[in-house]
């Protein structure tokens, strides 16, 4: 039985050219996290973080994606095209797969505040 919940940074905004941290957190389960996948809105993979083998950053993003903090991902040099949904998929044993959603809005405005708060999707 899957008892866990994924908490995410929810809906966040950041300014063009800036950076943002995409963060998910799995709670309320003793399941072992074996791998975390990060996907973009078009379902292309940004990165994989295997618990033992470390990070795999996809070539298309290697200059703009930094692993961490923790199981999260830092997206840098933001463009307007980065606006959209991001998904964290937690592969766990024995529970199975948990999935969280984050919506990122990239703003032109120089006064755009990077607002981020943890929430349960």
């Amino acid at each position: 039985m899957m008892t866990g919940t994924i908490e995410t940074t929810g809906n966040i905004s950041a300014k063009k050219g800036g950076s943002v941290i995409l963060q998910c957190h799995l709670s309320s389960t003793m399941a072992q996290v074996t791998q975390v996948n990060w996907e973009q809105h078009d379902h292309s993979l940004l990165a994989i973080r295997n618990a033992e083998l470390g990070w795999h950053i996809y070539p298309a993003f290697k200059d703009r994606v930094a692993p961490g903090p923790g199981l999260g991902l830092t997206l840098q040099s933001l463009t307007m095209n980065d606006t959209g949904e991001y998904f964290c998929t937690y592969h766990t044993y024995p529970d199975g797969t948990y999935r969280g959603r984050i919506f990122l809005e990239v703003l032109e405005s120089s006064v755009a505040e990077h607002s981020a708060r943890f929430q349960i999707p």
Partner: antibody, heavy 119, light 107 residues
């Protein structure tokens, strides 16, 4: 340049263990995950497992869990693969291979070590 | 485990021919796929990573494409030195698995 140099061929009896070494040069061994892949005669490549020398984490294929042990001696820039309870089906060429920095593809390979298990 | 089915298992082609090898994964692996070339008695060599990126120093006649479950490896104009066995490899999830190989021969 990057080089992975493996130990020589081994002949073992069924039930015995074998330990294959892989000496890395041309890069810092802690920066890349090291994997072991084997190839039985005429067969496909088979992933045994990988070790992240930086954090010491190991991942094994279920097939080899409990029978294979991957270790790294960072001071000697050498990775090791020990396989116990050998059987004839373990006769194969064993390769050490590293994954690219922040990638999982396997960019450099050792020359291979032939392990023959025969009574 | 993710099964990788490669086809054909062997093929014979002439110098200058366009050669295509396919690899099918038993489940979605996004673009977590690499292609290797192995010559007899030698270790494999990385040719293509992340499904479509040519590795450093690999000639432009080698290319890869695909995502999800279906992948293609192409040699645009076969050269005599391309005679080898080619393997696909998924690294989407452990245990990492390889295709059965495609042995390429010159007609």
């Amino acid at each position: 340049q990057v080089q992975l140099v493996q130990s020589g061929a081994e002949v073992k009896k069924p039930g015995a263990s074998v330990k294959v070494s892989c000496k890395a040069s041309g890069y810092t061994i802690t920066e890349n995950t090291m994997h072991w892949v084997r190839q039985a005669p005429g067969q496909r490549l088979e992933w045994i497992g990988g070790i992240n020398p930086n954090q010491g984490g190991t991942s094994y294929s279920q097939k080899f869990q409990g029978r294979a042990t991957l270790t790294v001696d960072t001071s000697a820039s050498t990775a090791y693969m020990e396989l116990s309870s050998l059987r004839s089906e373990d006769t194969a060429v064993y390769y050490c291979t590293r994954s690219s920095y922040y990638r999982y593809d396997l960019d450099y390979w050792g020359q291979g070590t032939t392990v023959t298990v025969s009574s | 485990d993710i099964q990788m089915t490669q086809s054909p298992s062997s093929l014979s082609a002439s110098v200058g021919d366009r050669v295509t090898i396919t690899c099918q994964a038993s489940q979605d692996i996004k673009t977590a796929l690499a292609w290797y070339q192995q010559k007899p008695g030698k270790a494999p060599k990385l040719l293509i990573y992340s499904a479509s990126y040519r590795y450093t120093g690999v000639p432009s006649r080698f290319s890869g494409s695909g995502s999800g479950t279906d992948f293609t490896f192409t040699i645009s104009s076969l050269q005599p030195e391309d005679i080898a066995t080619y393997y696909c490899h998924q690294h989407y999830t452990t245990p990492w698995t390889f295709g059965g190989g495609t042995k390429l021969e010159i007609k």
